[in-house]
C-alpha cells in the first residue's frame, strides 16, 4: 500500500534515501572492523506528509490521528522499507573474518 | 539486536506502545466501515535515545551519526516491530464483508 510519491513540500524535502559518508571512528567501529575504512551509509531521511509513501494501513491511521491530535500522535516516520547487505572484515577471537550484515544499509524508504 | 529497555529520560518517555481511542470519523472510515464504531488504536510513540530498543545495526549506526551530525541525521524513530490483526466489517459493492487487516494495530515497538 505504497501511497503517493509526490512530495508536497518541494523536491527532496520528503522521505527518501540519503547517503552519509562515515568513517569507522564515526560509527564507533574502529576497534572491531578492519574494512571498509569508510562507509557510504544509505539512510532514510525526510518528512512524511499526509499519505506520502505510506507503508501500510497503520501509517494511514497515524496520519489521520496526527492531524486530529498533533500533540499526542506523531506524524509517520521515514524508515527503511528494505535493506542492502554489507560485508565487513572484522576482528574475531581467532583473527579476522568476513561477516555479512543484512540490516545495515537502507535500500528504499517508506513512512510508518 | 534489540538493545536496552531502560529509558534514560524517565518512565514512559521512551518508545513504547500507546493506545489512542479513535472513532470511524476520526479515521476517515465512516463511509466504508460498519464495525467497530470505535477503535483502540495501538501505536508506537516516544523518544529513541542512544541504543534504546535499537531494532538492528542500521538503528545503531543512525544513533552514532545523529550524535555527530544532529542537523543532518535524525535520531532513530519509534515504529512498530510487529502488528496485531484486526477484523473490520466493511461495505462492499454487493453488501458487507468481513476483512482482516494484518498491519493495522501495533503489537510492539522498536527504534529504527
Amino acid at each position: 500500500a505504497r501511497n503517493g510519491d509526490h512530495c508536497p513540500l518541494g523536491p527532496g524535502r520528503c522521505c527518501r534515501l540519503h547517503t552519509v559518508r562515515a568513517s569507522l571512528e564515526d560509527l564507533g567501529w574502529a576497534d572491531w572492523v578492519l574494512s571498509p575504512r569508510e562507509v557510504q551509509v544509505t539512510m532514510c531521511i525526510g518528512a512524511c506528509p499526509s499519505q506520502f509513501r505510506a507503508a501500510n494501513m497503520h501509517a494511514q491511521i497515524k496520519t489521520s490521528l496526527h492531524r486530529l491530535k498533533p500533540d499526542t500522535v506523531p506524524a509517520p516516520c521515514c524508515v527503511p522499507a528494505s535493506y542492502n547487505p554489507m560485508v565487513l572484515i572484522q576482528k574475531t577471537d581467532t583473527g579476522v573474518s568476513l561477516q555479512t550484515y543484512d540490516d545495515l544499509l537502507a535500500k528504499d524508504c517508506h513512512c510508518i | 539486536a534489540r538493545n536496552g529497555d531502560h529509558c534514560p529520560l524517565g518512565p514512559g518517555r521512551c518508545c513504547r506502545l500507546h493506545t489512542v481511542r479513535a472513532s470511524l470519523e476520526d479515521l476517515g472510515w465512516a463511509d466504508w466501515v460498519l464495525s467497530p464504531r470505535e477503535v483502540q488504536v495501538t501505536m508506537c510513540i516516544g523518544a529513541c535515545p542512544s541504543q534504546f530498543r535499537a531494532a538492528n545495526m542500521h538503528a545503531q549506526i543512525k544513533t552514532s551519526l545523529h550524535r555527530l551530525k544532529p542537523d543532518t541525521v535524525p535520531a532513530p524513530c519509534c515504529v512498530p516491530a510487529s502488528y496485531n490483526p484486526m477484523v473490520l466489517i466493511q461495505k462492499t459493492d454487493t453488501g458487507v464483508s468481513l476483512q482482516t487487516y494484518d498491519d493495522l494495530l501495533a503489537k510492539d515497538c522498536h527504534c529504527i
Epitope: 578492519l34 574494512s35 571498509p36 575504512r37 542492502n84 547487505p85 554489507m86 560485508v87 565487513l88 572484515i89 574475531t92 577471537d93 581467532t94 583473527g95 579476522v96 573474518s97 568476513l98 561477516q99 555479512t100 544499509l105 | -
Partner: antibody, heavy 121, light 110 residues
Framework: EVQLLESGGGLVQPGGSLRLSCAVS????????MTWVRQAPGKGLEWIGI???????YYASWAKGRFTISKDSSKNTVYLQMNSLRAEDTAVYFC???????????????WGQGTLVTVSS | DIVMTQSPATLSVSPGERATLSCQAS??????LAWFQQKPGQPPRLLIY???TLASGIPARFSGSGSGTEFTLTISSLQSEDFAVYYC????????????FGQGTKVEIK
Amino acid sequence: EVQLLESGGGLVQPGGSLRLSCAVSGFSLSSYDMTWVRQAPGKGLEWIGIISSSGNTYYASWAKGRFTISKDSSKNTVYLQMNSLRAEDTAVYFCARGILVYADYGDHNLWGQGTLVTVSS
Amino acid sequence: DIVMTQSPATLSVSPGERATLSCQASEDIYTNLAWFQQKPGQPPRLLIYAASTLASGIPARFSGSGSGTEFTLTISSLQSEDFAVYYCLGVYTYISAEGAFGQGTKVEIK
C-alpha cells in the same frame, strides 16, 4: 599440529561434476574462514571464494553458479562442489585458512598441498 | 569485479640488488592486500598481509607499502632463495566480498 589436506581431485569429463574436500586438523572451522584458490598448469593463482566462520559464502564472479563452497564443522571438512566442468577448470586446487589478506592469530601461512583436477574427454 | 594488475611481468635483478614490484587494484581496497611468494611445485607462501605487515618467519628484507589502489612490495637486497614468482591478492568488500590475485611477477636472476 595444524594441517590442511585436500582430496577428491582426478580426471573428469567436460560437463561433469566433482566435489573436493579439505580436511583440517588442529583448529575448528567454526572459528576460522577458509579460502579456495586454484592454479592452472603453468599459470597464475586464481581466487575462487571463501566460506566464513559463520557459514556465509563469497565467490569470484566467474565461479558463481558453477562452484559452491560448504562445510561440515563436525567433520572438520570444507568442500568445493564444481559443476559443468570445462577444460579450462583443469588446475591444482588449494584450500587455505583465513581470508589471506589479514592474518589470523598463530600460523600466518596455512595452505594445503593441493589436489589436481583434470577436465578432459 | 575487482581486478588486480601487477607490473612488471618479469623482473631481472642481480643478487644483492633491490627489487620493487607493483600491484594496482581496480577498486579502493584500503589495506586488504597480501603478497605471496611461490616456487615451482609448492603452495604459495605468505610474505605480507594488511598491505604492510610482515608475516611471521619472513625476513625483514621484504616490505610492503600502499593503500587504496596502489601497492608495492620491496625486496631490499635479493638473496638467491628470493628468485620466484610473486603474487598480490586483494579483497574488496562492500555489498558483497570478492578477491582476486594479480597475474604474478617473475623475479629472475639477471
